[in-house]
Each structure stands twice: as structure tokens, then as C-alpha cells.
Interface confidence: medium
Amino acid sequence: MAFAPIPRITWEHREVHLVQFHEPDIYNYSALLLSEDKDTLYIGAREAVFAVNALNISEKQHEVYWKVSEDKKAKCAEKGKSKQTECLNYIRVLQPLSATSLYVCGTNAFQPACDHLNLTSFKFLGKNEDGKGRCPFDPAHSYTSVMVDGELYSGTSYNFLGSEPIISRNSSHSPLRTEYAIPWLNEPSFVFADVIRKSPDSPDGEDDRVYFFFTEVSVEYEFVFRVLIPRIARVCKGDQGGLRTLQKKWTSFLKARLICSRPDSGLVFNVLRDVFVLRSPGLKVPVFYALFTPQLNNVGLSAVCAYNLSTAEEVFSHGKYMQSTTVEQSHTKWVRYNGPVPKPRPGACIDSEARAANYTSSLNLPDKTLQFVKDHPLMDDSVTPIDNRPRLIKKDVNYTQIVVDRTQALDGTVYDVMFVSTDRGALHKAISLEHAVHIIEETQLFQDFEPVQTLLLSSKKGNRFVYAGSNSGVVQAPLAFCGKHGTCEDCVLARDPYCAWSPPTATCVALHQTESPSRGLIQEMSGDASVCPDKSKGSYRQHFFKHGGTAELKCSQKSNLARVFWKFQNGVLKAESPKYGLMGRKNLLIFNLSEGDSGVYQCLSEERVKNKTVFQVVAKHVLEVKVVPKPVVAPTLSVVQTEGSRIATKVLVASTQGSSPPTPAVQATSSGAITLPPKPAPTGTSCEPKIVINTVPQLHSEKTMYLKSSDNR
């Protein structure tokens, strides 16, 4: 599998409509929780929780602050932590508790605390519960949590130093935790947790399971340096711990290695960055998408692998276990365990079969089973990805977060659209197209190129958004910028399953937002632009330039995958010739203008899609070079002239192949501004041309003129 290509289109922050939320002096907007039924996005930041309108996040609806007392700050600083940054309250857990409350935990100046947030009054109830084991002490430490039926399952560190990892369930009747032992958790970096509900019609009366994803230091591979391993672990919701062995500890904790590698090249991605569980009506079993980087990532590599949950279940239900053996010098080595496995199967959830054998709860499990799972939490079998290879491998980028949306194209094909954020504040949107990856677009979400810390996807029909949290704020972006594709070709070549061309309105429309039936819409995921109707009207722009000057002709081709070339009077121009130059890879510069340069210039783009090359006329310019006598300006009016040589531009509509919409007149050079008089300058004798000066270039004005000095080059 080859590396993914560059994104086809790059949208700068200012180019697209992005809604932003940030509050002065509030940072680290890293906890996001969406309430779809209330159209509310809850945002946990440093020392604050906000509720904003999910359809327009700039509209703040509620706010509550949870600050650290000066006394607590001082105590924290005494322990060597920074009073300005670390000794504050970073909200790390933001989970739904009931219809009217949230469960919120914060680092609280290295004394983690939890509270209930009443959504009616938007006030904390002041419970001030100990957050140990639910929330990290250190804002820099990893954490993950999920609320399951009113009980918080979390993965974090249990002490001030962050040296004791824990996966726990906070429950009034049955709190459970992992053993503090290297075979269970070895310096883990927690990434994600979620509950997978057993289907109601499941025949074996199985339990809901809670899955944890993390990267930890390997126990099974021994090298000179510490090898990191990505893991999937799971516990059973019904687990109540053991009666004597594993009392108040998980009896169902099992973990396995996640494989994400490129077999042909030996590329192994072993650091897990994020996980997204894709649930869709069309999916019998959820699919989880995992984002990885290699351990030694000096080239900026990232990969996405997708896994069927049933593959993981199979490993836990029927896979072989690993066992530690002591070799010379009390050195521990982990190998496959081939001996007898006690019954009931160690680590299994209590199902109908266990209940039939009178094991109605984990408290009834025999010591043999419990001792075995205590000593053998690691599976020998690994969880392998769908198709045994990554969905995407990208070079020169560090991906940080992933969300995935399953959508149906116009032809009925289902696509998993991956939205992946980067450590430079961008969002990539990618799909798999016939075993190749197509990165539809890259959107610069954050102007300051800061890492995206959290990504969230709304699943409500109609208004669909991606929400991204960073240190400075939250950004809301639509799933597609269909309207930005100005022509049918652009719309089709985007190969965006959310977008289709609507011939009646001559616009690229978002499929999920069109109420009307999709009849007549054009979408071709193969990128075959020949399906587009013939253009009846295109536009060309007429320019008048002065003899001896320089002209710059614009060509706004957004595609990064297209090659741009220019034609003059139907002959292809060589940009290398001293007469011509390319500016910004696309705009044509013509030097030392003479009458022979008058004529029609066409900017064409050539884009390779599959085995076809698609040609498009992107812009058409009609250039006329004239010898124009210098206008006489009345002494009372000053016209500040700038370098350049264009004296007029007209936009005309004509029958051409190009179909770009007319754009405002462009400057011949970018070398400064023109100061224009308040009224048209009075001209001298009658033999000189009358020059009309408009301060704002109008698209269809008969004359939009600029006064320029002659070019002395």
C-alpha cells in the first residue's frame, strides 16, 4: 500500500465558514460532550465548563467556573509544580450522569476532584468527591473515561507521581480496579474507552463490555530500548470482582496487542493516538478505527487501521493466553501458554453457559479461574485489522485525533469518511477508493497551527458538524464545503460522497441537506467529469495593458493534484522562456508587453484521476496591448501611481469551455496600493482617452480602470 497522496484541496482558515468559541483567559478546551437531543455542546476547559449551542458554538448558553483556591495552589507549588500552569484545575472528565446532570472531574491542583453539574441551574452541587483513580493528578498525564449506566469507568494514574496506573469502575455498590502489577498495566498511556452493548437478541445471554485502548511498554518483546505496544483491553460490565482472589479487582480484565503495520515494508505503527468506534445501522458489529504513529517518528508518519470488534472478541473468547516464565538470572520472558485452561474460561463474562453451571456472578468463580486470569491478563493472539493492512498511511504529518462517518453516495455505495486532525491545527478528510486513499480536503481549523486535542462528530441528521478542541478554543466545521466547488467538474473531481452537482441551480450541493429527491444530481465517485453537462456560458476577462509593461493573469485552480499550463492562441506556453513566468505556480506573468502579446490566453488544468486525465479550462483572458498617451491630471488632484502596467479590465460573458464564475479584476502586480482621487480625474485635451476611476472594481462595469506608472524593467 502506497502512502496517501496530498490532500486534493487545501482550505485556509479564512476561506471557509468555520464557527469558533473561545473565552478570554481560558485555555485547554480538551473535553467535549455533545447532547444531540438538546442541541448543546458541553465544553470542559481549564477551570471552566461551558454549554454552547451545538448548531452555532459561538452562542454561549451557560458557563460555570471551577477554580482552585490560593491555598491549594500554594500547596501544589510547594510540591514543585508550576503555580501558573500545573496547579490549576483542568477538566478531564465530562460525562453524562442523568438527563439533568453531568459528572465532572478536574485535576484540581494535583488533588483530583469530581462533582455533579446540575444542568438546570448550571451549578456544581458541591459534592467535591475524591477524584483519585477517576482523573489524573497531572494535567500532562493520559486519561480516558466512559460513563456506563451511571457508573464511571476510567483509565488514568492513581498517584501524584503518575507512576501507578489504574483502570477502575467508580460504583457505590461494586467498585473495581486493576491489580497494580506490570503484567496488567505497564506504564500505559490511555487513549480511549467505550462501552459495547451486547445485542438484546444475543443467544448466550452475554454481558455488556467496556473496552479500553492504550499504549504501554511491552513485556513480551525484549530489546535494548523500551518497545511500545498498542493494546485493546476489555472488562465485563457485570463483573463484581472475586470473593477472595481478586477481591474488588477485575476478574474479566484481558488485553491483547493491536496490529497496524505495512507487511511489505516492515513499517510497524505501535503508538496508539486515538480510537473511534463506528456504529451504523448497516453494521452488525461495530468497527473501530485506530490512529497510530511509529515509535521512532522522525519522518512524521501516521496510519489508520480499522478493526471489526468481532475480531477482538474472538481473541478474548477463544485466543491463547501468554505466560511469564523465569529464565536465567531471574529474567522474565513471556511466551505462549499451551497448558490446560480452567473452566469457566478465565476473563470470560458471565453468560448463560456459566449461569447454567451455577456461576451466576464473578463472586462465585472458582479460585483456579481467578488465579489464572490474575497471572495471565495478556493474550498471545493479536487483533488484526480489516484487510490485514492500514486504511491510510500518511507521510509528513502527525495525526492527533480521528472520527469516522459512514455515508452513502448517490449510487448507493457506502463510504467510511475519515476525519483526521493534525498537530498543526488542520483537519484531513479521507476515503478509501478502490484500495487507494483519496484525501478529499485539508481544512486549517486553527489559525495558529496548534495541535487539535479533541475531535467530536455530530450524528444528528440534517445539521452535521465536526467539533475540534485545542488549547485556545473550539472550532465547528461542516462535514463538507460543497458550495465552494464552483463548477460541475470541480464538484465531481472533489470525489466527496457528501457533495453532488445540481444542474438546475448550477451549484454543488450537500447531499444530506437536500430535501428534494436526488434525481438529476450528478455525483461520480470515480471522478469521471465527462458526466458534466456542456457549458453554455463561461466567462472571459478582457484586459488592456500598456506597451512595455508586465501583465499577471490569474488562474485560480484549487486542486493540489492538478497541473496548470497556459495556452496562447491555442499554443502551449513554455514558462521557462524569458518572456513568461509563473507566479505562485499558477498565475502567468508576461514581461515586456508588445502588440504581439495581444490575444486569448487560457489557463488549463490537467488532473489525473484513476487512468484518465481530466482537462479543464480554468480561466480565459483576452489581452490587448495598447500604446496609451499619459493622461494629464489636474494639479489639484494627486494620483499616486504604483509599479505595473494595466490600464483596464473588463469581465465579459461568452460561450467558452471555461465555467469559472467571473471574479473581480486582479492587480497586475502585488507591489502596493493605489490612492485614488474622490472624483474621476479631469483629463486634458480631447484627443486623450477618458479614464474612469472606480475605487471598487465592479464585476460588470464597462470600465474599471487603474492608473499605473510605466514599467521600467
Epitope: 451545538a54 448548531l55 439533568t100 444542568l119 438546570t120 441551574s121
Partner: antibody
Framework: QVQLQQPGAELVRPGSSVKLSCKAS????????MHWVRQRPIPGLEWIGN????????HYNQKFEDKATLTVDKSSNTAYMLLSSLTSEDSAVYYC???????????WGTGTTVTVSS | EFVLTQSPTTLAASPGEKITITCSAS???????LHWYQQKPGFSPKLLIY???NLASGVPARFSGSGSGTSYSLTIGTMEAEDVATYYC???????????FGGGTKLEIK
């Protein structure tokens, strides 16, 4: 059953003050914002302000900032609104109402008709 | 200043008729924050619909609400004599905290 009981009417002199009460029964005040709303034929219903009975945090409509003062007595489960410097313009029906969530009032008081007259 | 404009201000209808009252916001709001009340003569207002389309408890199913952005509406599927009242739309809390009511629509019987 949740109810908010208010006295039926108050007759007061211009320039004086009046303290309106709103007693909750069937639920405690804490955990819900308690609001006060004024109703006159024109302009209709107007929001005056709200109070959180648990810690007495208040918010006022700017228009009523110098007119109304909201308080609460948790022990008697009663919310109060003090209206000061009364003029004939303040003659209206005043309702207390409980907020049920995203700014909607699910329980309304019976209303007190205030008449300012010399 | 944020304003909710209701139309019509008065409406006379016969029992069995379908009634629609509209509420227009001066700027876009979340559907989560738009609510409707019914006030019968001599009584306190009563919550009818909350969050644009959710019926308050005890409200007959002939009442429904819809809308988004700046345009919202209350519909009575088939009017009954007991529906004679004034109907108000209201925008709920947002920051800064300000709760705004529409001017009201008086529904009378023909």
C-alpha cells in the same frame, strides 16, 4: 404536586416599596432557578430576573436592575421580590416561575396583582 | 436588542380548523431555547411546548411545534373551544441571561 403560591393582590402608594412572596410546595426551591415575570397589557410578558435559591446568585433584566431585588428564604421554601420606588407604571401582575431546563418555565405562580395608586 | 415577533396578533377561528401561529426571531437561536405558553383569561401562563417541539405533560396531541434558526411555529391540528387563549413564544436562557417573550397571539372563536 408542585405549586407556587402568591398573594392575590397588593395595593401600594407611589414612591413606596412592596415585597412580593412566592411559596413553593411539593418541591424544594433548591436546584431550580426561580424567575419573576411582569405582565401588563402592553408590552405583555417581561422577564424581570432570576435567583438560584441554593446560593442566591441573581441575574436581572437591565430594565429592572434598579427596580427589583430578589431574595430567597430556604427555610420557608419561599422566594421574594422587593419592588422599590413604585410608580403607576409598575402596576401589573407579577408572576414567579420555576425554570425547568433550557430556559423554559414549567411551573408558574398564581400571580400577584400590584396596583400603585394614591 | 433581541426581539421575538409573533403573527398574527389576533386570530379568530372556528372549532375544527387548523391554526398556525408563527414566531420570528430577530437573530438565529438554537431550537433548544424556543418555548410556547398558553394563557387563558384570568389564569397564569402554562407551559405548552418546550424546546421547539416537545409537548409539556398533559398537553393534548393536537398541539405541535416546529422550526429552526429564526423561524418557529405553533400548530393546533384541529381547534377546540377550550383552546381560546393567548399564546406566547419565548426564548430561553443564553449568556448574557435574558429571557424574551413574543408579543402574544390572541386566539378567539369565530
Amino acid at each position: 404536586q408542585v405549586q407556587l403560591q402568591q398573594p392575590g393582590a397588593e395595593l401600594v402608594r407611589p414612591g413606596s416599596s412592596v415585597k412580593l412572596s412566592c411559596k413553593a410546595s411539593g418541591h424544594t426551591l433548591t436546584g431550580f432557578w426561580m424567575h419573576w415575570v411582569r405582565q401588563r397589557p402592553i408590552p405583555g410578558l417581561e422577564w424581570i430576573g432570576n435567583i438560584d435559591p441554593s446560593d442566591s446568585e441573581t441575574h436581572y433584566n437591565q430594565k429592572f436592575e434598579d427596580k427589583a431585588t430578589l431574595t430567597v428564604d430556604k427555610s420557608s421554601n419561599t422566594a421574594y421580590m422587593l419592588l422599590s420606588s413604585l410608580t403607576s407604571e409598575d402596576s401589573a401582575v407579577y408572576y414567579c416561575a420555576r425554570e425547568g431546563g433550557t430556559g423554559y418555565f414549567d411551573v408558574w405562580g398564581t400571580g400577584t396583582t400590584v396596583t400603585v395608586s394614591s | 436588542e433581541f426581539v421575538l415577533t409573533q403573527s398574527p396578533t389576533t386570530l379568530a377561528a372556528s372549532p375544527g380548523e387548523k391554526i398556525t401561529i408563527t414566531c420570528s426571531a430577530s437573530s438565529s437561536i438554537s431550537s433548544n431555547y424556543l418555548h410556547w405558553y398558553q394563557q387563558k383569561p384570568g389564569f397564569s401562563p402554562k407551559l405548552l411546548i418546550y424546546r421547539t417541539s416537545n409537548l409539556a405533560s398533559g398537553v393534548p396531541a393536537r398541539f405541535s411545534g416546529s422550526g429552526s434558526g429564526t423561524s418557529y411555529s405553533l400548530t393546533i391540528g384541529t381547534m377546540e373551544a377550550e383552546d381560546v387563549a393567548t399564546y406566547y413564544c419565548q426564548k430561553g436562557s443564553s449568556i448574557p441571561r435574558m429571557y424574551t417573550f413574543g408579543g402574544g397571539t390572541k386566539l378567539e372563536i369565530k
